[in-house]
């Protein structure tokens, strides 16, 4: 902490400007009014303050707002956001998507920090659900965001938000997460026709039950092997050789290359050899 010392004559800050970069830490503490700083936060980012000077400015804001900063200040924190701890952020009440975007911009290009994770958590909890605009914003900054949520957190995603999800947003999701997302996607895309529906639902099929896969096998969808490999083992096991052949269409030949990998291996093992032989791929059950 900076000692309380009187501001030297003529050094009292009238506004936040570049002259402050020449102030020592104790001078910033003594000569910059916290209320002035709060109203002119938008200027701070245009001034090349040192990390030590930013520490002083943060300290002044902390003293002014011990219960947490107001959103008018939060929105203009800029690089000062990087000085905040998760504990600081837990005191905030962020409701504006613009505020969220402004702070995510500061951290852009870096992995999700504990500060950002706390900020997002506060924002989403404040909204009560992960709406489409929020999801759009978060996945734009962090493509893996959706898969970082627990199944419990994902349950708050309304089906309408699923339209914002891109295939790459689901790349790192595990089966438990897809179990939650798949029914929402099914609901969201239910009014689409066959081929359009398959294009949209494809990324979510890692959460599909056997009966849905059987239904898809009747629709000439020609599922690729990459999608088939992401299906739930328990959903794949009951499929017959004929159903898998229909589901994959021309891609069925790809089973040979994946015969040592799950879930293909599990499925092969549980088929009758006579049935496997009809595929002509040399698969051994």
């Amino acid at each position: 902490e900076v000692e309380k010392t009187a501001c030297p004559s003529g050094k009292k800050a009238r506004e936040i400007d570049e002259s402050l970069i020449f102030y020592k830490k104790w001078e910033l503490e003594a000569c910059v009014d916290a209320a002035l700083l709060a109203t002119q936060m938008d200027r701070v980012n245009a001034i090349p303050f040192t990390y030590e000077q930013l520490d002083v400015l943060k300290h002044k804001l902390d003293e002014l707002y011990p219960q947490g900063y107001p959103e008018s200040v939060i929105q203009h924190l800029g690089y000062l956001f990087l000085k905040m701890s998760p504990e600081d952020i837990r005191k905030w009440n962020v409701t504006s998507l613009e505020t969220l975007k402004a702070l995510l911009e500061v951290n852009k290009g870096h992995e999700m920090s504990p500060q950002v994770a706390t900020l997002i958590d506060r924002f989403v909890k404040g909204r009560g659900q992960l709406d489409k605009d929020t999801l759009d914003t978060l996945t734009a900054f962090y493509p893996g965001y959706l898969c970082s949520l627990s199944p419990e957190e994902l349950s708050s995603v309304p089906p309408s938000s699923i339209w914002a999800v891109r295939p790459q947003d689901l790349d790192t999701c595990d089966p438990r997460q897809l179990d939650v997302l798949y029914p929402k996607a099914r609901l969201a895309f239910q009014n689409m026709n066959g081929s359009e529906y398959f294009v949209k639902i494809q990324s979510f099929l890692g959460g599909a039950p056997t009966e849905d896969l059987k239904a898809l096998s009747q629709q000439n969808v020609s599922m690729d092997l990459a999608t088939f490999m992401k299906l739930r083992t328990d959903a794949v096991l009951p499929l017959t050789v004929a159903e898998v052949q229909k589901l994959l269409g021309p891609h069925v030949e790809g089973l040979k290359a994946e015969e040592r990998h799950r879930p293909v291996r599990d499925w092969i093992l549980r088929q009758r050899q006579d049935d496997l032989d009809t595929l002509g791929l040399g698969l051994q059950g």
Epitope: D174, L237, R260, H261, R262, R265, D266, L269
Partner: antibody, heavy 119, light 107 residues
């Protein structure tokens, strides 16, 4: 509640064949979901998977042991067995049988049996 | 074969500590990675399957995460009964492999 119990000689001479049997109780070796594995652990070392068998008789072995290993199943006795030929001192280990549910992992294990290879 | 490299090989921790063990696969294992706990003289016990699913009867302080090549087992608050050796195992490829183990000791 499925339980597994290994049985077989605790001492085997070098170059001979190690033979162990795992008896399944409280469940069936013919279960649709389950694979039956042998896993070993040399003293003070880590775990090494030997191979598995499905009730249909389909097997899959660790490539490093494949030339010496045979796993078989006897559905009438509710047992599966391991044979490891041409043993050396390096095969001295605790041998475990384990059930693998296709949806989870090795969720049920035998208590293990120590096999020493020595003349 | 897919090699599973566990780190650290051993660690010392106190009751109440948060402990993290990592496992790296030499090639993608998707999410087909399991975690086991083994105490001296006992058979291993399944803790986590499919990278992040908690096995029935296992305390919720154990959690797993990861996919592809990097996996983590976390014990949120170490209890006296948790001092043991932990192994990861991949079952994606037909030739199953275990990590070398991580021994968690009392500090």
């Amino acid at each position: 509640q499925v339980q597994l119990q290994e049985s077989g000689p605790g001492l085997v001479k070098p170059s001979e064949t190690l033979s162990l049997t795992c008896t399944v109780s409280g469940g069936s070796v013919s279960s649709y979901h389950d694979l039956w594995s042998w896993i070993r652990q040399p003293p003070g070392k880590g775990l090494e998977w030997i191979g598995y068998i499905y009730y249909s008789g389909s097997t899959n072995y660790n490539p490093s042991l494949k030339s010496r290993v045979t796993i078989s199943v006897d559905t009438s006795k509710n047992q599966f067995s391991l044979k490891l030929s041409s043993v050396t001192a390096a095969d001295t280990a605790v041998y475990y049988c384990a059930r693998e549910d296709a949806l989870t992992g090795f969720d049920i294990w035998g208590q293990g049996t120590m096999v020493t290879v020595s003349s | 074969d897919i090699q599973m490299t566990q780190s650290p090989s051993s660690l010392s921790a106190s009751v109440g500590d948060r402990v993290t063990i990592t496992c790296r696969a030499s090639q993608s294992s998707r999410y087909y990675v399991n975690w086991y706990q083994q105490k001296p003289g006992k058979a291993p016990k399944l803790l986590i399957y499919a990278a992040s699913s908690l096995q029935s009867g296992v305390p919720s302080r154990f959690s797993g995460s990861g996919s592809g090549t990097d996996f983590t087992l976390t014990i949120s608050s170490l209890q006296p009964e948790d001092f043991a050796t932990y192994y990861c195992q991949q079952s994606y490829d037909a030739s199953y492999t275990f990590g070398g183990g991580t021994k968690v000791e009392i500090k």
